[in-house]
Structure formats: C-alpha cells, structure tokens
Interface confidence: low
C-alpha cells in the first residue's frame, strides 16, 4: 500500500477519506487505527457502528470520528481540534472476523501556522464535502507519499 499524506492545521479539523471497493467490502465494519512504530501493531482508535446497516452514523472516540458511506465506498475520519501529537501514521481498515484488511495507509501532518497555507483551498473541490454534516470542518490537502519518502523518520 502506498501512503497518502493528509495535512491539517493545528487547532482545526482534518477530514481523512479512504475510498474502497464497496462490492468487495460489502457487509464489513471499518476501523481507524494508529501505527505504533514502523513495524509495530496498529492500535485501534475508533470503529464504525456495531450494526453494519448503521455504519453511516458518526461514532466518536475523543476527538476522532468515523463514518462509512457503504454504498459509495468511502470511509471518512474526522480529527477535531488537530494537535501536533496527532501527527503520525494511521490505517483505514476493513474488518472481517478477527482479520483486518488495510484500505489505506495515511500519514497525518500537522501544520503549525495557518498563514503558510492560506491558499490551500485552491486545491480542494468543494463538492466533495457536501455529504458531511459538519459545516465547520476544514478542507484537507492530501497527496501520495513519493517513492523514497519514509513515513517514519530514521532513528539515530
């Protein structure tokens, strides 16, 4: 899996989207987990509703929310009041039994100074946020991690 970078501004909300094949993952609950170190386990942060039919309902764990558009095939995670310690590598997962398939690897970057990215909105397509109920959510910037880039800095 390639890693997709999502950048957000400290103190604001960041929305992460994980597209998936709605046919293949039909009937499966989803989860958002945080990778603990390069080779470490992925620690569950929040998962979708226990009843798959209610996956569209937003579930919160602290400042992190998850909602699943099972027809369209998009899992959306909202990180509210983004803080520097939220930066790191995460995964969107599809759950089946005791197994979990990785839908997307995500590197969250937290930008300290919003003025440095005041033109970031030019990169966003407003229509993409229309189905979400949080009107205050800030638009995120995402890109794929370039070949050779590493999500974890080398340890000295």
């Amino acid at each position: 899996h390639n890693t997709t970078v999502f950048q957000g501004v400290a103190g604001q909300s960041l929305q992460v989207s994980c597209p998936y094949d709605s046919m293949k993952h039909w009937g499966r609950r989803k989860a958002w987990c945080r990778q603990l170190g390069e080779k470490g386990p992925c620690q569950r942060v929040v998962s979708t509703h226990n009843l798959w039919l209610l996956s569209f309902l937003r579930r919160w764990n602290g400042s992190t929310a998850i909602t699943d558009d099972t027809l369209g095939g998009t899992l959306t995670i909202t990180l509210r009041n983004l803080q520097p310690h939220d930066a790191g590598l995460y995964q969107c997962q599809s759950l089946h039994g005791s197994e979990a398939d990785t839908l997307r690897k995500v590197l969250v970057e937290v930008l300290a100074d919003p003025l440095d990215h005041r033109d970031a909105g030019d990169l966003w397509f407003p229509g993409e946020s229309e189905s979400f109920e949080d009107a205050h959510v800030e638009h995120s910037i995402s890109r794929s991690l370039l070949e050779g880039e590493i999500p974890f800095p080398p340890t000295s």
Epitope: S22, M23, K24, L53, T70
Partner: antibody
C-alpha cells in the same frame, strides 16, 4: 464484451492434481469476484470457491478446503483453480463464473460463465 | 450451509402455457445489508448456466419479460408466463447471501 475462456479437457489419474485456467476479457478483472462451480455428470451445480483478483482474497467451500487452491494473475487476467488428491468423484465439468456488478453493492450473482472444462479422473 | 430445495424436480408444459418453480431455503436469505441474494439460472442442454433473475426479481439483461421472480425470506418462485420451446433446460435457484454459495437441485423443464 465480457468473455471467460477456459482451458481444455483433462484426463487425470486418481491421486494427481489438475489446474484449470479461465482467461477473462472485456471487464475490470481485478475488481470482480471470480467463482468456480462444478457439475458432475447428470448432477447439479456445486460452488467450490471464489477469489478477488485485486488482492488474492479467497473463500472456499468447506467440502473442498485443503484440496482446492484458487489463484489469479492480474497481468494476464487469468484465474486458476487447482484441485489436488483427485478421486473418481471429482469427474465433472468445472466452470469459472464472474459475479455480477451493476450498482455499487448490488452484486453476488454469476452473470458470465466460462464454457466449462471437463476433468475426467480415471485409472 | 444454506440448503436450497426446489419443487417440482421436473415439469412438462405445453407451449404457451404458464410454468412455476418453487425454491425454499433452510434459513432466511436476507443479508445484513437488507438485500436478498436469491438468483435463478437456466442451463440449456449442452450449455453453461446462464443468469435469468438476480436478487429475487431483477431480470438480467436480454432475459424476456415472460420470466419473473418473486418471494421473500425463505420462499421464492420463478414464473414463466408463456412457455416457449427455447425455454427447455434445467432451472436452478441459488443463494449468495452466505458463503458457501449454494444451489437448488434443479428443475428440468420439458415441452409437451
């Protein structure tokens, strides 16, 4: 148009293995489940298993677990079904069949079938 | 596994007359997503099976409108309003709500 073309008939000895191929064309091979179904002479249809070529995810019927292996080669859009430890009861026509995909999530019916491959197990 | 039971196992019909095949499953075929994955296939003599009806009542492309499917839960029916000579073959109901997918024993339709 969608086409599934299977390999030719095989005659095998009991205890041996057979590998049947199914070459797909006319659709996105990687993102549709491919099934294998068999039909013994004069009998009904029996589902053996399926594969999602996009990532190799497989499910098998309990009856064939441990004896059947379904694989897929995305580069050639070809699915394979290998059945080992053959016995005379495995004599059948083996079909590959794609799962229907129209609206998102409205799937799980086999809309296109290969022409079938007759496997005869005889000493 | 879900057991699919078809009745009758054979049917002899005069052209132009209706025909009906029943299919019963050993457990409900309603998926957790609300859909019911019950399908009907026809296998004509010497041919591969072909899809007729998917998800209880949806005719597959190219299937004549004389074919219709109905039912819910565990009881389903395939109806042919006016049988034609080309309809001969073996009809199978099948479920894909649960893995492993299973088929009925088949109903052989003959023309009188």
């Amino acid at each position: 148009q969608v086409q599934l073309v299977q390999s030719g008939a095989e005659v095998k000895k009991p205890g041996s293995s057979v590998k049947v191929s199914c070459k797909a064309s006319g659709y996105a091979f990687s993102s549709s489940w491919m099934n294998w179904v068999r039909q013994a002479p004069g009998q009904g249809l029996e589902w053996m298993g399926r594969i999602y070529p996009g990532d190799g995810d497989t499910n098998y019927a309990q009856k064939f677990q441990g004896r059947v292996t379904i694989t897929a080669d995305e580069s050639t859009s070809t699915a394979y079904m290998e059945l080992s430890s053959l016995r005379s009861e495995d004599t059948a026509v083996y079909y590959c069949a794609r799962l229907l995909r129209n609206q998102p999530g409205e799937s799980y019916a086999m809309d296109y079938w290969g022409q079938g491959t007759l496997v005869t197990v005889s000493s | 596994d879900v057991v699919m039971t078809q009745t009758p196992l054979s049917l002899s019909v005069t052209p132009g007359q209706p025909a009906s095949i029943s299919c019963r499953s050993s457990q409900s075929l309603v998926h957790s997503n609300g859909y019911t994955y019950l399908h009907w296939y026809l296998q004509k003599p010497g041919q591969s099976p072909q899809l007729l009806i998917y998800k209880v009542s949806n005719r597959f492309s190219g299937v004549p409108d004389r074919f219709s499917g109905s039912g819910s839960g565990t009881d389903f029916t395939l109806k042919i309003s006016r049988v034609e000579a080309e309809d001969v073959g073996v009809y199978y109901c099948s479920q894909s709500t649960r893995v492993p997918y299973t088929f009925g024993q088949g109903t052989k339709l003959e023309i009188k």
